[in-house]
């Protein structure tokens, strides 16, 4: 039994790091393998992660961690019974993938303005809370070419757009994802999308 693709890990910079790897053949990850991880710090104890299958030869492990700080560094040992298959290390702050924003809502109660709001996926005491920026993707269900991305680089998780910038009388969907420049993170996953009907009416012109 050998490791074909070494484990790569990303952290949500809160409580979970996810490591993925591939074996050289079909493997029952949960029964045959264990990933041990330990914070490089005096008196810290080793923890064991039981991996799950992720495709035929792929494995994935969700490592539970206490509040992460930028200096944290973990040793990783991948075991198959008594056999050490791979040894490595992981610094969560250097491999951050933020959590996906939630609660995306499109407020359409004003005819000429759309307000899109969502929730920051971190609690206020987490460092990333004040450092996330967002990409909002809006697309038409009727027209694949009507696809736009708004890069929201201010802190407030909201986006106001004039309803007239979208086509009237058709349905749109929106989703949002996050990243943090300070840690040069990857993008989060997209939030679940939300749908609305854009029914903007041109203002009546008086002659």
């Amino acid at each position: 039994m050998k490791v074909l693709q070494e484990p790569t890990c990303v952290s949500d910079y809160m409580s979970i790091s996810t490591c993925e790897w591939k074996m050289n053949g079909p493997t029952n990850c949960s029964t045959e393998l264990r990933l041990l991880y330990q914070l490089v710090f005096l008196l810290s104890e080793a923890h064991t992660c039981i991996p799950e299958n992720n495709g035929g030869a792929g494995c994935v492990c969700h490592l539970l961690m206490d509040d992460v700080v930028s200096a944290d560094n973990y040793t990783l040992d991948l075991w198959a019974g008594q056999q050490l298959l791979w040894k490595g290390s992981f610094k969560p702050s250097e491999h951050v993938k933020p959590r996906a924003p939630g609660n995306l809502t499109v407020h359409t109660n004003v005819s000429d303005t759309l307000l899109l709001t969502w929730s920051n996926p971190y609690p206020p005491d987490n460092y990333l809370y004040n450092h996330l920026t967002y990409a909002v993707n809006i697309w038409s269900e009727n027209d694949p070419a009507d696809f736009r991305i708004y890069n929201v680089t201010y802190l407030e998780p909201s986006l106001r757009i004039a309803a007239s910038t979208l086509k009237s009388g058709i349905s749109y969907r929106a989703r949002v994802r996050a990243w943090a420049q300070c840690y040069n993170t990857t993008w989060s996953e997209w939030s679940p999308s939300t749908k609305w009907h854009n029914s903007y009416r041109e203002p009546f012109e008086q002659h």
Epitope: N109, V110, L115, L155, E156, S158, R160, I161
Partner: antibody, heavy 122, light 107 residues
Framework: QVHLVESGGDVVQPGRSLRLSCAAS????????MHWVRQAPFKGLEWVAV????????YYADSVKGRFTITRDNSKNTVYLQMNSLRAEDTAIYYC???????????????WGQGTLVTVSS | DIQLTQSPSLLSASVGDRVTITCWAS??????FAWYQQKPGTVPKLLIY???TLDSGVPSRFSGSRSGTEFTLTISSLQPEDFATYYC?????????FGQGTKLEIK
Amino acid sequence: QVHLVESGGDVVQPGRSLRLSCAASGFTFSYYGMHWVRQAPFKGLEWVAVIWYDGSNKYYADSVKGRFTITRDNSKNTVYLQMNSLRAEDTAIYYCARWGGFGVTGTHLDYWGQGTLVTVSS
Amino acid sequence: DIQLTQSPSLLSASVGDRVTITCWASQDIAGHFAWYQQKPGTVPKLLIYAISTLDSGVPSRFSGSRSGTEFTLTISSLQPEDFATYYCQHLNSYPYTFGQGTKLEIK
């Protein structure tokens, strides 16, 4: 059209409290973050506080943190600034302003009220 | 906190002159940067946002630009109504600080 009207300014003694109000009209108040900015006599502008569209987050200048509280009532289209433990250096005209605009460039104060004067003096 | 240093604090110029006012940010900021004009006894008025976008109704003789952490407001040909105090503001992260202001006076 957008209209912001501040009220509540007064002459108060150091250590006392005061609450300013800013009544908004002409736009969907609950869609917009609101700010307070102040200007001491013959001085420049100083940003004081912001409250997000839904009241969920509030941020303050270091000079007022722990003494001032910004709140809003979206049902009344009003934003407030509760000022406690007032000092002489809080003497200023206080403006409320809308965090305005559309799209991703919507980070500026596009409409301002006329201001209300707060004088802290014994 | 991001500090803004605005220069000059006082600028004397004549009608028709081209003038520039500069703001330096203490650290790199995104494009959330605005300029305001204030005349004595009146409320500040938004001139430029997102570094270079003119607010509606602002004459085209006003322009804004950026080079790194240096932001510039340029008035291409001063008009009598332009004599006022100008403030820069960053809106990148809280607190949203202002520059100290530049008073533009008639020479």
